[in-house]
């Protein structure tokens, strides 16, 4: 008798109502491998989830996140709000990065500025709440005179002659 | 068969009231947090509120000290009081089970409402 149910193929279960007779998966449900006893009952994408595959006989419906969530967990398991650039999702909805800290991604947490200095670098050009800091040469590095937010001359590649 | 319905939508004035109430069956109610999202003509979701099984209450900073949730577990019916409303308020608000827990976060099985309009106008 296991025999008969290793030969009903996927989108099909083993009917033991009906002397184990390969019969069609019912409406909104699938099985994704041959020899089933039941078909699983399909994912429905409802509330901020939206379609991006429909079920078939043979495999689950997937979904996505409408706009303004994104994707969290495996098989996109959970929506999240999105935040824009330069603000975090807090207990009281989106927020501004504090200061000394940024977020250049609409999702994520804001993360403290690059420290140029434990690098022995200086601060090339300030941070921003949606953007770290860039850092530059170390101080010693500069010329005497030259200021700290001067950037260096590029480098030259080789075979092109300075302009 | 889980079911959410809301209810208590409505025209009102700026400064006005609603009180909005999601009678739920088919579920654990009594064991669920619950949540409230809207939806405004031409922009996207937004979590609203949300209520922790034990209680326990979260509001976005749009609404925070105008909206109230709450619940009644003998009911089966989770409730949005709606206070000193504004025009941006006019949106259609849906009931939802919160199973993440996560502000502005639903889980693939948390259950929905049909959403009932509020709009507010004078």
């Known amino acids: 008798l296991q025999d008969l149910c290793s030969n009903c193929p996927a989108g099909t279960f083993c009917d033991n109502n009906r002397s184990q007779i390969c019969s069609p998966c019912p409406p909104n449900s699938f099985s994704s491998a041959g020899g089933q006893r039941t078909c699983d009952i399909c994912r429905q994408c409802k509330g901020v989830f939206k379609t991006r595959k429909e079920c078939s006989s043979t495999s689950n419906a997937e979904c996505d996140c409408i706009s303004g969530y994104h994707c969290l967990g495996a098989e996109c398991s959970m929506c999240e709000q999105d935040c824009k650039q330069g603000q975090e999702l807090t207990k009281k909805g989106c927020k501004d990065c504090c200061f000394g800290t940024f977020n250049d991604q609409k999702r994520g947490i804001c993360r403290p500025w690059t420290n140029c200095s434990l690098d022995g670098k200086s601060v090339l050009v300030n941070g921003t709440k949606e953007r770290d800091v860039v850092c530059g040469p170390s101080p010693a590095d500069l010329s005497p005179g030259a200021s700290s937010a001067t950037p260096p001359a590029p480098a030259r590649e080789p075979g092109h002659s300075p302009q | 068969e889980v079911d959410l319905v809301e209810s208590g939508g409505g025209l009102v004035q700026p400064g006005g009231s609603l009180r909005l109430s999601c009678a739920a069956s088919g579920f654990t109610f009594s064991r669920s947090a619950m949540s409230w999202a809207r939806q405004a003509p031409g922009k996207g979701f937004e979590w609203v509120s949300g209520i922790y099984s034990g209680g326990s209450t979260y509001y976005v900073d749009s609404v925070e000290g105008r909206f109230t949730i709450s619940r009644d577990n003998a009911k089966n019916t989770v409730y949005l009081q709606m206070n000193s409303l504004k025009p941006e308020d006019t949106a259609v608000y849906y009931c939802?089970?919160?199973?993440?827990?996560?502000?502005?976060?639903?889980?693939?099985?948390?259950?929905w409402g049909q959403g009932t309009q509020v709009t507010v106008s004078s």
């Open positions: 939802a089970t919160w199973g993440s827990q996560q502000i502005g976060v639903w889980h693939e099985d948390d259950y």
